[in-house]
Amino acid sequence: SEVEYRAEVGQNAYLPCFYTPAAPGNLVPVCWGKGACPVFECGNVVLRTDERDVNYWTSRYWLNGDFRKGDVSLTIENVTLADSGIYCCRIQIPGIMNDEKFNLKLVIK
């Protein structure tokens, strides 16, 4: 089952996600999407990183921490009831089916 996180309408929501880079600066791509993690990639992508930097993000969705050190937690600004639901944080580790997938449930009050 998904870990549940809560936020109030008009506030910021924080969805934690971490990994340990194999070596300093040796990053793997990460994607955040709305909806449970599918077999591959992320559905409804809201933010994505590559091996170096953030390369895609959408309004109100931001990386919250020091992602170059493995903190890929997500901040959603000024949430509404429509932001409720499951979010997928996917650590895209090279190789067949090596990805780490985290489904996080956001409840807006």
Epitope: P24, D53, S59, D66
Partner: antibody
Framework: EVQLLESGGGLVQPGGSLRLSCAAS????????MSWVRQAPGKGLEWVSA????????YYADSVKGRFTISRDNSKNTLYLQMNSLRAEDTAVYYC???????????????WGQGTLVTVSS | SYVLTQPPSVSVAPGKTARITCGGD??????VHWYQQKPGQAPVLVIY???DRPSGIPERFSGSNSGNTATLTISRVEAGDEADYYC???????????FGGGTKLTVLG
């Protein structure tokens, strides 16, 4: 080309107020966190305040909390710093600086303005 | 609160290598960024995320970060490298940006 142009500096008496502006161009302003950084004469850099891209979250150094207010008008591509209850130790060149792509706090300062001098003296 | 410690000054002969350190408790767990500031000018980003170099910055500038020390290395130093150099981190415990005290690099001769 990214450009940041500060204005509003000048001479003000202790206890007085001043409002700094930073006009931004050459990038999608609302997509970036912004900060103010200051430098007292002959001293090092000191971060003053930051604001998220939407303006929904603000952060302050302890030395200015309660006296300074950061804000932004994304429709005008402009960053502001309202400075109240000014003290002699607030005398400095004030720079506005743009944060990094896709990060809530900005993480580092990719582009800087040329600065505006604020002098607090009687 | 978190403190970044830099040597006040470093001197180096032209063509040699200058190393400027930035000390902090487990600074290797944070991303470090470096700025160059020449007299009367605004700071310029020279290294970000420990070791990445912005476009336009010469390859002579490099960075590393591990343990309690981050280092900015300038190889084949030129007279034009004479400036103040500052390290910077984002301290997520306080949500404050922190700068080191700055290091004045003097190019001898």
């Amino acid at each position: 080309e990214v450009q940041l142009l500060e204005s509003g500096g000048g001479l003000v008496q202790p206890g007085g107020s001043l409002r700094l502006s930073c006009a931004a161009s050459g990038f999608t302003f609302s997509s970036y966190a912004m900060s103010w950084v200051r430098q007292a004469p002959g001293k090092g850099l000191e971060w003053v305040s930051a604001i998220s891209g939407s303006g929904g979250s603000t952060y302050y150094a302890d030395s200015v909390k309660g006296r300074f207010t950061i804000s932004r008008d994304n429709s005008k591509n402009t960053l502001y710093l309202q400075m109240n209850s000014l003290r002699a130790e607030d005398t400095a060149v004030y720079y506005c600086a743009r944060g990094s792509y896709g990060t809530y706090y900005g993480n580092y300062f990719e582009y800087w303005g040329q600065g505006t001098l604020v002098t607090v003296s009687s | 609160s978190y403190v970044l410690t830099q040597p006040p000054s470093v001197s180096v002969a032209p063509g040699k290598t200058a190393r400027i350190t930035c000390g902090g408790d487990n600074i290797g767990g944070k991303s470090v960024h470096w700025y160059q500031q020449k007299p009367g000018q605004a700071p310029v980003l020279v290294i970000y995320y420990d070791s990445d170099r912005p476009s336009g910055i010469p390859e002579r500038f490099s960075g590393s970060n591990s343990g309690n020390t981050a280092t900015l290395t300038i190889s084949r130093v030129e007279a034009g490298d004479e400036a103040d150099y500052y390290c910077q981190v984002l301290d997520r415990r306080s949500d404050h940006f922190l700068f080191g005290g700055g290091t004045k690099l003097t190019v001898l001769g």
